[in-house]
Interface confidence: low
């Protein structure tokens, strides 16, 4: 399984403007992440952004903007001034270097036949955005939650109206579950059109962050913004998954080999689970 | 332990190729990209090639670019350098390295490129 | 590329004295700086990761500083065995680059 995700979005309202999202998923500190395009970066890619945890970012045109999105992912805005895109066939790489235990590069692309108008994929692939996952999942919940409680309403009038306790849901939370098809599912990462069952489960779902600010007791913690949740979320566009490999600046005093990713999840809505990080010293 | 240990360096000369190898034992040689680094007589140390766990990416200065060739053998636990087209300026002990930054070092192969 | 520049080829401590190297980058490297002691006869050992970090097994007198494009190694209590060439490395851009070395002497 790959240590980095790689998923390129094209915005439903603004056919010229692109997202770039790129997440770690090995245990260890985030040192450093860079996204590139048109390669890797030193490899014919030019940079797009450098984000570091502590010195913050920098972003090169054109790059709009530049943000973490988690602990463990990134988010670049990229704005094409031009009239035909030139990010449609554009390859985008992101870097997260972990030192020194080590660095992972994976690319990704925008599909030529994504059409940003689509208010669902054709056909499922593992895209599903924190925020919406959220705002869906807990519409979903409220709006069964208060069918119900009318229809009690309305058949028993006489009884007393069962309270509806509210489910504990932080963002973190959402957006462990709502990734889950792009970190853990190795149908989606060899076959983008796997059919993802992506169960949202407020309730009983808790959260991982298996490559957490803390296993290196030396960084200072970084404290991530959050997904954002705005109304104006556009409806995604198709989206790719290209995996390329680990180890691409491999740096020393990495920890143990992986076996896997450090992110475990589970169907049966007991959410993901951490996976103990195996870390040397990076 | 880690260990990592170079052999194929020798005498050559100018327009000459030679192929260095680097024996990899003591972790998971597949999981971790691995490096050449060459130390010029008067010491000054240059990083001259770098490649990914799987050998997908490879990476090069300028100063060898066309040159120099990285790859690995990962069922060999075997890093490998081709060089070509060697001059006299490449005369140099080659490290291989784990990592970036180098954490564990071979102790070198020296090459002479004379005529 | 990202010049790495060590200006003082020699520097001179007794033992147990504090010694500090400098090294410069050409342009701003954030933190990705690493520091390197070779001994003579031996290849080199990574001694500073990510300007401040030290790497497994190193003695916490050598401490590292720095950011942007100004970096230090300091050795506090020099002992004989540190008796080496000191060099910095930038880990923030391809191609890696290397400074020219400091030899620490020991009086």
């Known amino acids: 399984t790959p240590e980095v995700w790689v998923q390129v979005q094209m915005e439903a309202t603004e056919l010229s403007s692109f997202t770039v999202h790129c997440g770690f998923l090995g245990p260890g500190s985030i040192s450093l992440v860079t996204v590139s395009w048109g390669g890797p970066d030193g490899a014919g890619g030019t940079k797009l952004a450098v984000l570091h945890p502590e010195l913050g970012t920098r972003q090169w045109a054109p790059a709009r903007q530049a943000r973490w999105e988690t602990q463990s992912s990134i988010s670049l805005a990229l704005e094409d001034s031009g009239a035909s895109s030139p990010f449609a066939n554009t390859t985008f790489c992101c870097k997260f270097a972990s030192f020194p235990e080590g660095s992972w590069e994976s690319c990704g692309s925008l599909p030529p036949s994504s059409d940003p108008g689509l208010s669902a994929p054709p056909t499922p692939v593992p895209i599903l955005r924190a925020d919406l996952a959220g705002i869906l999942g807990l519409s979903g919940v409220l709006l069964f939650g208060c069918g119900y409680l009318l229809h009690l309403l309305r058949r028993q009038k006489h009884r007393p109206t069962p309270r509806l306790q509210p489910s504990h849901t932080n963002s973190q939370a959402l957006t462990a579950q709502a990734w889950a098809p792009s970190q853990a599912s190795q149908a989606a990462l060899h076959d983008p059109y796997a059919t993802i069952n992506t169960s949202f489960c407020p309730a009983t779902l808790d959260t991982a962050h298996p490559n957490g600010w803390a296993s290196l007791p030396t960084h200072a913690a970084h404290q991530p913004q959050g997904p954002a949740a705005s109304a104006s979320t556009p409806i995604l566009a198709r989206g790719s998954f290209v995996s390329v490999e680990n180890g691409l600046y491999t740096q020393a005093g990495e920890r143990p080999p992986h076996t896997g990713p450090g992110l475990t999840l589970f169907p049966d809505c007991r959410g993901p689970r951490a996976v103990e990080g195996r870390f040397g010293v990076r | 332990e880690v260990q990592l240990q170079e052999s194929g360096g020798g005498s050559v000369k100018p327009g000459g190729s030679l192929q260095l190898s680097c024996a990899a034992s003591?972790?998971?040689?597949?999981?971790?990209?691995m490096s050449w680094i060459r130390q010029s007589p008067e010491k000054k140390l240059e990083w001259v090639a770098e490649?990914?766990?799987?050998?997908?990416?490879?990476y090069y200065p300028d100063t060898v670019t066309g040159r120099f060739t990285i790859s690995r053998d990962n069922a060999k636990n075997t890093l490998y350098l081709e060089m070509s087209s060697l001059r006299s300026e490449d005369t140099a002990m080659y490290y291989c390295?784990?990592?970036?930054?180098?954490?564990?070092w071979g102790q070198g192969t020296l090459v002479t490129v004379s005529a | 590329d990202v010049v790495m520049t060590q200006s003082h080829k020699f520097v001179s401590t007794s033992v147990g004295g504090r010694v500090s190297i400098t090294c410069k980058a050409s342009?701003?490297?954030?933190?990705?700086v690493a520091w390197y002691q070779q001994k003579p006869g031996q290849s080199p050992k990574l001694l500073i990761y990510?300007?401040?970090y030290r790497f497994t097994g190193v003695p916490d007198r050598f401490t590292g500083s720095g950011s942007g494009t100004d970096f230090t190694l300091t050795i506090n209590g020099v002992q004989a065995e540190d008796l080496a060439v000191y060099s910095c490395?930038?880990?923030?851009?391809?191609?890696?680059?290397f400074g020219g070395g400091t030899k620490l002497e020991i009086k």
């Open positions: 990510s300007t401040s």
């Open positions: 490649i990914s766990s799987g050998g997908t990416y490879t």
């Open positions: 490395q930038q880990h923030y851009s391809t191609p890696r680059t």
């Open positions: 390295a784990r990592g970036d930054p180098f954490g564990y």
């Open positions: 003591g972790f998971t040689f597949s999981s971790y990209g």
């Open positions: 342009q701003d490297v954030m933190t990705a």
